[in-house]
């Protein structure tokens, strides 16, 4: 039987909720302009969908989406409408080596640009079991893609 790895279990207190806790603003070196942020978000919307399609071997079926999944956007007043990248980044960094896909590396680069916090980055470990690894990757990819897509609508 599979046992869920401890590090995965407490990893970051979950995908998206953590961002609000981790935000410690000490003033960014360069503050992105709203238009720049919007351009990155639009690009991420396209990339995340393509990355999910790649992972699912171009699956065209409608994926189940639960509207009460946590938002991937922060409500922070200093970064209105910005992606909660500090919460998402550790997960993408964890799954990226398994994806072996340039898109995931580029997504990480873009999320890094939106990461205005100097908060210490929590490490996220991939599950060791193959099935759990696949579930972990697909959960994150689908969540991120759906979250961005949902916002675009």
């Amino acid at each position: 039987m599979v046992s869920h790895i401890g590090s995965t279990r407490f990893a970051l207190f979950l995908l998206c909720c953590l961002g609000t806790l981790m935000f410690s603003h000490t003033g960014p070196i360069y503050q992105l302009q709203p238009k720049e942020i919007q351009a990155i978000i639009v690009e991420l919307q396209n990339l995340s969908k393509k990355l999910l399609d790649d992972y699912l071997n171009k699956e065209k079926g409608v994926q189940k989406f639960d509207s009460d999944l946590p938002s991937c956007f922060t409500s922070d007043s200093q970064a209105p409408g910005n992606i909660n990248s500090s919460a998402i980044l550790p997960y993408f960094k964890a799954i990226s080596p398994s994806l072996n896909n340039d898109k995931s590396l580029y997504i990480i680069e873009q999320l890094d640009k939106l990461n205005f916090q100097n908060a210490p980055e929590t490490e996220v470990s991939m599950p060791t079991d193959n099935f759990e690894r696949k579930r972990f990757i697909l959960t994150i990819l689908r969540w991120f893609s759906n979250c961005l897509e949902h916002r675009a609508q």
């Epitope: 039987m1 699912l56 079926g61 189940k64 639960d66 099935f131 972990f136 697909l138 959960t139």
Partner: antibody
Framework: QVQLQQPGAELVRPGASVKLSCKAS????????MNWAKQRPGQGLEWIGM????????HYNQVFKDKATLTVDKSSSTAYMQLSSLTSEDSAVYYC???????????WGQGTTLTVSS | DIVMSQSPSSLAVSVGEKVTMSCKSS????????????LAWFQQKPGQSPKLLIY???TRESGVPARFTGSGSGTDFTLTISSVKTEDLAVYYC?????????FGSGTKLEIK
């Protein structure tokens, strides 16, 4: 629409083997795992195992480890379950079911009624 | 293996009545990554294959009537039918999809008076 087609019935002799099929259509076969379950007459459902068609990773319920062998043929989008050394205890309805690993089993085949009798 | 316990094993109700059935797991089914409980409810009508009603403990599958509601978290789950119809005559199974083997409950048989 998603469809999982299974033969209606199979009649086999005790001690023999049988290979049950499940032909998938209406979705990308390699994007979802395939589960198999057993249901004896008037009884509940028992999970046999699952296979990932993309790379043939398999997980069995230990109870069925020596009884069932799961395989797939990607070219025909068909999943198979071979049952060996059949006895009357193996007489049951066998279902294949599509597994979305993020959510759940979401589509079931109509089931194959296996009768083991001499 | 995770053990799934369902109760009652059967119940008989009149059309229009509210029905509640329980499913308990021997360990938590909460997946920490997305805070979803990997618990599904299936309906199996006589002579038919099972049909998905609820996944993630409380998310109704597309096309399933609103009278079916799933609730609960961790180890205790409930399926409620707000106003039973004659076509609801079936056996209802819960299944955990948290970790393999993906065990089923023994089922609750719903009969109509």
């Amino acid at each position: 629409q998603v469809q999982l087609q299974q033969p209606g019935a199979e009649l086999v002799r005790p001690g023999a083997s049988v290979k049950l099929s499940c032909k998938a259509s209406g979705y990308t076969f390699t994007s979802y795992w395939m589960n198999w379950a057993k249901q004896r007459p008037g009884q509940g459902l028992e999970w046999i195992g699952m296979i990932d068609p993309s790379d043939s990773e398999i997980h069995y319920n230990q109870v069925f480890k020596d009884k069932a062998t799961l395989t797939v043929d990607k070219s025909s989008s068909t999943a198979y379950m071979q049952l060996s050394s059949l006895t009357s205890e193996d007489s049951a309805v066998y279902y294949c079911a599509r597994q979305d690993i993020v959510t759940t089993v979401d589509y079931w085949g109509q089931g194959t009624t296996l009768t083991v009798s001499s | 293996d995770i053990v799934m316990s369902q109760s009652p094993s059967s119940l008989a109700v009149s059309v229009g009545e509210k029905v509640t059935m329980s499913c308990k797991s021997s360990q938590s089914l909460l997946y920490s990554i997305n805070q979803k409980n990997h618990l599904a409810w299936f309906q199996q009508k006589p002579g038919q294959s099972p049909k998905l009603l609820i996944y993630w403990a409380s998310t109704r599958e597309s096309g399933v009537p609103a009278r079916f509601t799933g609730s609960g978290s961790g180890t205790d789950f409930t399926l409620t039918i707000s106003s039973v119809k004659t076509e609801d005559l079936a056996v209802y199974y819960c299944q955990q999809g948290y970790t393999y083997p993906f065990t089923f409950g023994s089922g609750t048989k719903l009969e109509i008076k």
